[in-house]
C-alpha cells in the first residue's frame, strides 16, 4: 500500500495548562524507519517526540506504538504552555545506510493555538 501520512486537523485550540492530542495516521509502515514529530520547519525545527524509545517530558503516544501493525502515531501534549504554540508535523523517515535517516513524507501540519487560561 502506498505510504501516506495524514494529520486530519489543520488546527487545534487548547487552554494553557490543559492537554491536547495531535493526530497522525499512516497508510503503510514501509519502508521501515522511524516516525517523529516536529514543531516548525527547516533547520530551526524542534523535535517534539520520536517513536524510538526516548523519553520526552509532557509528550506521550496515544496508541500502543509497540504493536507491530500500529499505524496510529498520534501524540498527547500535557500541561500546554504558550511556548507550545506553533505548527506540528508528523514525519515518516526511511532508515538510512548511515546516519541520518532520510525524511520521506510529512503530514500537512497541525497548528496549535494556546488560549489564555480562564481566570
Amino acid at each position: 500500500k502506498e505510504l501516506k501520512v495524514t494529520q486530519p486537523e489543520k488546527s487545534v485550540s487548547v487552554a494553557a495548562g490543559d492537554s491536547t492530542v495531535l493526530n497522525c495516521t499512516l497508510t503503510s509502515l514501509l519502508p521501515v524507519g522511524p516516525i517523529k514529530w516536529y514543531r516548525g520547519v527547516g533547520q530551526s525545527r524542534l523535535l517534539i517526540y520520536s517513536f524510538t524509545g526516548e523519553h520526552f517530558p509532557r509528550v506521550t503516544n496515544v496508541s500502543d506504538a509497540t504493536k507491530r501493525n500500529n499505524m496510529d502515531f498520534s501524540i498527547r501534549i500535557s500541561n500546554v504552555t504558550p511556548e507550545d504554540a506553533g505548527t506540528y508535523y508528523c514525519v515518516k523517515f526511511q532508515k538510512g545506510p548511515s546516519e541520518p535517516d532520510t525524511e520521506i513524507q510529512s503530514g500537512g501540519g497541525t497548528e496549535v493555538y494556546v488560549l489564555a487560561k480562564p481566570s
Partner: antibody
Framework: DVQLVDSGGGVVRPGESLRLSCAAS????????MSWVRQAPGKGLEWLAG????????YYIDSVKGRFTISRDNSKNSLYLQMNSLTAEDTAVYYC???????????WGLGTLVTVSS | ALTQPASVSANPGETVKITCSGG??????YGWYQQKSPGSAPVTVI????KRPSDIPSRFSGSASGSAATLTITGVRVEDEAVYFC???????????FGAGTTLTVL
Amino acid sequence: DVQLVDSGGGVVRPGESLRLSCAASGFTFSSYAMSWVRQAPGKGLEWLAGISAGGSDTYYIDSVKGRFTISRDNSKNSLYLQMNSLTAEDTAVYYCARETWNHLFDYWGLGTLVTVSS
Amino acid sequence: ALTQPASVSANPGETVKITCSGGDYYSTYYGWYQQKSPGSAPVTVIHSDDKRPSDIPSRFSGSASGSAATLTITGVRVEDEAVYFCGAYDGRTYINTFGAGTTLTVL
C-alpha cells in the same frame, strides 16, 4: 539495571504442557513489547512469539501457532509462555527478550531449559 | 532465511567483518547477538542496523545496505571469542528471524 529472569522449565513427557514465566525489573515493563526466543541443543536461535506492550496484540512463528500462547501481566511485571502438546522438538533453552522500538532485542533473560522426553 | 558464514578467525588487534544476507533493505532492520557458550544468555551488541547499546565497547559497529548487514569488530580481543548471530525484523511479515550463527575464533 534491566533484569529478566526466566523460570518454569523442567522435564515433561510428550503431549504435556508447561508454562514459562519471565520476571522483569529495572525498567517500565508496561512500555515495552516482549518476545520469547528458544535455542535447541547445538542449534541456533529461533524466535517464537512476541506481544505488544499493552498485551492486546500477539505474533507467532507458524510452527508454534495454536500450541503456544504468549501473554503478560503488567501489574506483576511478568511475561508468560503457555506451551501445550509438547514434542521432543520443543526441547530447548527458552529466553525472554525485551524488544526495541523496531522489534529487535536489547536485553535477554538468562534462559530456562525445557526437556521433552518419554 | 538469513545467511552468515559458519566461522571466521582473526589475530588479536585485527579487524573482523561478519556479514549477514537475505533481508530486504526496504522492510528489514538487523541486530547482532553475541553468545559466549551454548545455552548462555545472548548479549545484544548491535540493534537497529548500527545502534550499539551503551555497555558495549566501541570496537563493535554495525552497518546495513542493500540486502546485507555487517558486524565489524575493530581491534578484536580474545574475550570477543563467541558465536555471533545476526537477527532481523521484517516489517512486511511482522516476523523475526535469525542466522545460523558465526563462530569467531581469536587466534
